[in-house]
Interface confidence: medium
């Protein structure tokens, strides 16, 4: 049986970014027809992960896993009946709590982003890492880069692979 | 608001193992009163991740995230009413699909383990990585090591931190 996943292409891109392997990221982005400016924007985010070392990738992977499997994420999907849920509702749509986090990572202030992460994982080392990554992204990315990253996310969320 | 997570101590241990940082792993294991033989068993698993490099940790992190956020995991928890779910059922218990995967990783054959991973993430590179890790664990761990790892998992699943 092949199980449905919550927006698999999103997680493919996230882990390719956090991994620091440009080739893996390119393969994932090709699947959603990313433009050159969108690729550049994602690679700038990728550079922040790789520059801050393995621990940064692991801690942020932990945050992503925690949010994705949190009651908040699961709870949001359970506005429908159990049968509905089993059929379709939750199957492939990305959880709103994950979306919120990604949006704040790009468009929020460092404090807003760290505050959202703290709702899910309050370990000081995790929060410090979140702030470092956010500061790096703000230093590296222009407003145009951030708009391109957001437009790529729209492509991901609306992709048949999500 | 501090959200409930699905068995946070389990994910802390998983990411500490996959990270290859002995200190982080020791800190996590101390929280569940791990014995010396249990620690040794977990460090043997950790060695397999470290030996297979960054890509191994990233791909296995992707598998864990995918299973944890899959319809299979979420669906299993939704046998109760929505209200029940929001209160308690899903809050902190580890998803049975994750448990199954971990059990097969330790006690199954490589084929059984890879087949279970394939239900969630069928990318060839992911499946090849799963087989490499499984073969490594089988080569490194004695039967006694595996029993110790399973007893540690029981401690994790029944811990107040789960």
């Amino acid at each position: 049986v092949k199980m449905a996943e919550t927006c698999p292409i999103f997680y493919d891109v996230f882990f390719a970014v956090a991994n620091g392997n440009e080739l893996l990221l390119d393969l994932s982005l090709t699947k959603v027809n990313a433009t050159e400016p969108e690729r550049t924007a994602m690679k700038k985010i990728q550079d922040c992960y790789v520059e801050n070392g393995l621990i940064s990738r692991v801690l942020d992977g932990l945050v992503m896993t925690t949010i994705s499997s949190s009651k908040d994420c699961m709870g949001e999907a359970v506005q429908n009946t159990v049968e509905d849920l089993k059929l379709n509702t939750l199957g492939r749509e990305i959880c709103p709590a994950v979306k919120r986090g990604v949006d704040l990572f790009l468009t929020g202030t460092p404090d807003e982003y760290v505050e959202q992460v703290a709702q899910y994982k309050a370990l000081p080392v995790v929060l410090e890492n979140a702030r470092i990554l956010k500061n790096c992204v703000d230093a590296k990315m222009t407003e145009e880069d951030k708009e391109n990253a957001l437009s790529l996310l729209d492509k991901i969320y609306t992709s048949p692979l999500c | 608001v501090k959200m409930a997570e699905t068995c946070p101590i389990f994910y802390d241990v998983f990411f500490a193992v996959a990270n290859g940082n002995e200190l982080l792993l020791d800190l996590s294991l101390t929280k569940v009163n791990a014995t010396e033989p249990e620690r040794t068993a977990m460090k043997k698993i950790q060695d397999c991740y470290v030996e297979n490099g960054l890509i191994s940790r990233v791909l296995d992190g992707l598998v864990m995230t995918t299973i944890s956020s899959s319809k299979d995991c979420m669906g299993e928890a939704v046998q109760n009413t929505v209200e029940d779910l929001k209160l308690n059922t899903l809050g902190r218990e580890i998803c049975p699909a994750v448990k199954r995967g971990v059990d097969l990783f330790l006690t199954g054959t490589p084929d059984e383990y890879v087949e279970q991973v394939a239900q969630y993430k069928a990318l060839p590179v992911v499946l090849e990585n799963a087989r490499i890790l499984k073969n490594c664990v089988d080569a490194k761990m004695t039967e006694e090591d595996k029993e110790n790892a399973l007893s540690l998992l029981d401690k994790i699943y029944t811990s107040p931190l789960c």
Epitope: N21, E22, D47, K140 | -
Partner: antibody, heavy 120, light 106 residues
Framework: QVQLVESGGGLVKPGGSLRLSCAAS????????MNWIRQAPGKGLEWISY????????YYADSVKGRFTISRDNAKNSLYLQMNSLRAEDTAVYYC?????????????WGQGTLVTVSS | EIVLTQSPDFQSVTPKEKVTITCRAS??????LHWYQQKPDQSPKLLIK???QSFSGVPSRFSGSGSGTDFTLTINSLEAEDAATYYC????????FGQGTKVDIK
């Protein structure tokens, strides 16, 4: 073994241009991020630019932004630095340096450097 | 831009003595801090990566510690060949070097 050899340095007038090259050998060049770092005579190290393994992302220090361009040719195992609108304060030894794979350590191997002198 | 400040600027030490060099970042950089040694007329060499990880082939007398904003390079039992300038580099957000610390032998 890892080897990085810079070339292209020399004397140039203010406002002039120069192109530095770095020939890499002993490793799979296309897997690694690469940097240019400089050191003015008797002074400390200054990072000026780096480029991702595939060449699609580049970064610059504010002091050279808009004047210098980093690029690479993975087929030729070569890294380049195009320097335009040169100033006296750009006089320095220019080093190319490799990052560890997946950026696991910045500047794990360096070349011997090439001297650029900007003077009228 | 993240600014790194090293101290001291200069240190004169007798052989077998312990040397401590500090590097302070203007904002938290986690463990993304690296140490280099540069001897006269040579290119720099990586000693310590990510605050505390020894680079391959580096003698065990060199060690690093710290995280966040405060970092330390320690040379236990200085040898004559350790006379050099030592630099810290942050890689958390782009890259910047400290101004350097010159160590010479008394």
């Amino acid at each position: 073994q890892v080897q990085l050899v810079e070339s292209g340095g020399g004397l140039v007038k203010p406002g002039g241009s120069l192109r530095l090259s770095c020939a890499a050998s002993g490793f799979t060049f296309s897997d690694y991020y690469m940097n240019w770092i400089r050191q003015a005579p008797g002074k400390g190290l200054e990072w000026i630019s780096y480029i991702s393994s595939g060449g699609s992302t580049t970064y610059y220090a504010d002091s050279v932004k808009g004047r210098f361009t980093i690029s690479r040719d993975n087929a030729k195992n070569s890294l380049y630095l195009q320097m335009n609108s040169l100033r006296a304060e750009d006089t320095a030894v220019y080093y190319c340096a490799r990052d560890g794979k997946y950026n696991t350590s910045p500047g794990d191997y360096w070349g011997q450097g090439t001297l650029v002198t900007v003077s009228s | 831009e993240i600014v790194l400040t090293q101290s001291p600027d200069f240190q004169s030490v007798t052989p077998k003595e312990k040397v401590t060099i500090t590097c302070r970042a203007s904002q938290s950089i986690g463990s993304s801090l690296h140490w280099y040694q540069q001897k006269p007329d040579q290119s720099p060499k990586l000693l310590i990566k990510y605050a505390s990880q020894s680079f391959s082939g580096v003698p065990s007398r060199f060690s690093g510690s710290g995280s966040g904003t405060d970092f330390t390079l320690t040379i236990n039992s200085l040898e004559a060949e350790d006379a050099a300038t030592y630099y810290c580099l942050q890689s958390s957000s782009l890259r910047t070097f400290g101004q350097g610390t010159k160590v010479d032998i008394k």
